[in-house]
């Protein structure tokens, strides 16, 4: 069967430019190695925001310079994207790949529309 991936339709980033959402997948097999990728779709262009490979039961580790952090629990991944600005508003797609053992399975979520509103600058106070 195809691997189903669920993620929320809409998320509002915090005033500090942080957005969190859960990406949940229904695994058709007993994977030990899983790769999670966050993609951003703007118009018809798809770009990779961040990616992490983890072993089931271990923590999810993104690269040190990544704007993403995350934790995993079973077939659920809690993703946080930091440093977002208004121009980063868009559709963020969660992609899950069961890398090992074979067979490989792919699951792509419908995407989470993340809205980012730049904070108003604080007025000068006398």
């Amino acid at each position: 069967k195809a691997m189903h991936v669920a993620q929320p339709a809409v998320v509002l980033a915090s005033s500090r430019g942080i957005a969190s959402f859960v990406c949940e997948y229904a695994s058709p097999g007993k994977a030990t190695e899983v790769r999670v990728t966050v993609l951003r779709q703007a118009d018809s262009q798809v770009t990779e925001v961040c990616a992490a490979t983890y072993m089931m039961g271990n923590e999810l580790t993104f690269l040190d310079d990544s704007i993403c952090t995350g934790t995993s629990s079973g077939n659920q991944v809690n993703l946080t994207i930091q440093g977002l600005r208004a121009m980063d508003t868009g559709l963020y797609i969660c992609k899950v790949e069961l890398m090992y053992p074979p067979p490989y399975y792919l699951g792509i979520g419908n995407g989470t529309q993340i809205y980012v509103i730049d904070p108003e600058p604080c007025p000068d106070s006398d």
């Epitope: 195809a2 190695e33 399975y105 792919l106 792509i108």
Partner: antibody
């Protein structure tokens, strides 16, 4: 622009070995899964093997498992296919193809192909 | 392994005609993870459609894809002379990545 150039094809006797290469340019090679796909004369497309981004994960079609080895050198932007114990049914044009960003199993760019003929 | 069946094997049409190509999967493991490719004689295949219905970069809008689960369709709304070729469907939802046998669209 994305370019994939295969080399190494030729005529080889059954049971012998051959190594194909695919030189990639125009994109960040280490960020993409890479495939070999073959096409026997007058036939359809047959996926042969894939190697993932970092080279740690590899998958093969049953027809070549144990005989072919896919590898990559990210420092040289080159993909390889080492073929052992070649059979007549391995005769085909071998294409190197890039996996897509959205899904590694989408072949979004292809090389021009290199012909491998296995014959005595 | 997911087996893909394409029909018809050959489609004989004239320029300006509408072409409807079918691809059926043996199981729903492909979901919407289906791509279509065009191949002309002596050339490498070219990606047309992915995700069952999304056009690849630079593909004219006369090409459209539809379907999900096990039944998929590639439609060419008005055939141009350069569209006469062989078309393959391919699933990428699970390994091994499998392709259909192809549909040849030739000039009547």
């Amino acid at each position: 622009q994305v370019q994939l150039v295969e080399s190494g094809g030729g005529v080889v006797q059954p049971g012998r070995s051959l190594r194909l290469s695919c030189a990639a340019s125009g994109f960040t090679f280490s960020s993409y899964g890479m495939h070999w796909v073959r096409q026997a004369p007058g036939k359809g497309l047959e996926w042969v093997a894939v190697i993932w981004y970092d080279g740690n994960n590899k998958y093969y079609a049953d027809s070549v498992k144990g005989r072919f080895t896919i590898s990559r050198d990210n420092s040289k932007n080159t993909l390889y296919l080492q073929m052992y114990s070649l059979r007549a049914e391995d005769t085909a044009v071998y294409y190197c193809a890039r996996g897509g960003i959205l899904a590694a199993g989408i072949f979004d760019y292809w090389g021009q192909g290199t012909l491998v003929t296995v014959s005595s | 392994e997911i087996v893909l069946t394409q029909s018809p094997g050959t489609l004989s049409l004239s320029p300006g005609d509408r072409a409807t190509l079918s691809c059926r999967a043996s199981q729903s493991g492909s979901s919407s993870y289906l791509a279509w490719y065009q191949q002309k004689p002596g050339q490498a295949p070219r990606l047309l459609i992915y995700g069952a219905s999304s056009r690849a970069t630079g593909i004219p809008d006369r090409f459209s894809g539809s379907g999900s689960g096990t039944d998929f369709t590639l439609t060419i709304s008005r055939l141009e002379p350069e569209d006469f070729a062989v078309y393959y469907c391919q699933q990428y939802g699970t390994s091994p990545f499998t392709s259909g046998p192809g549909t040849k669209v030739d000039i009547k």
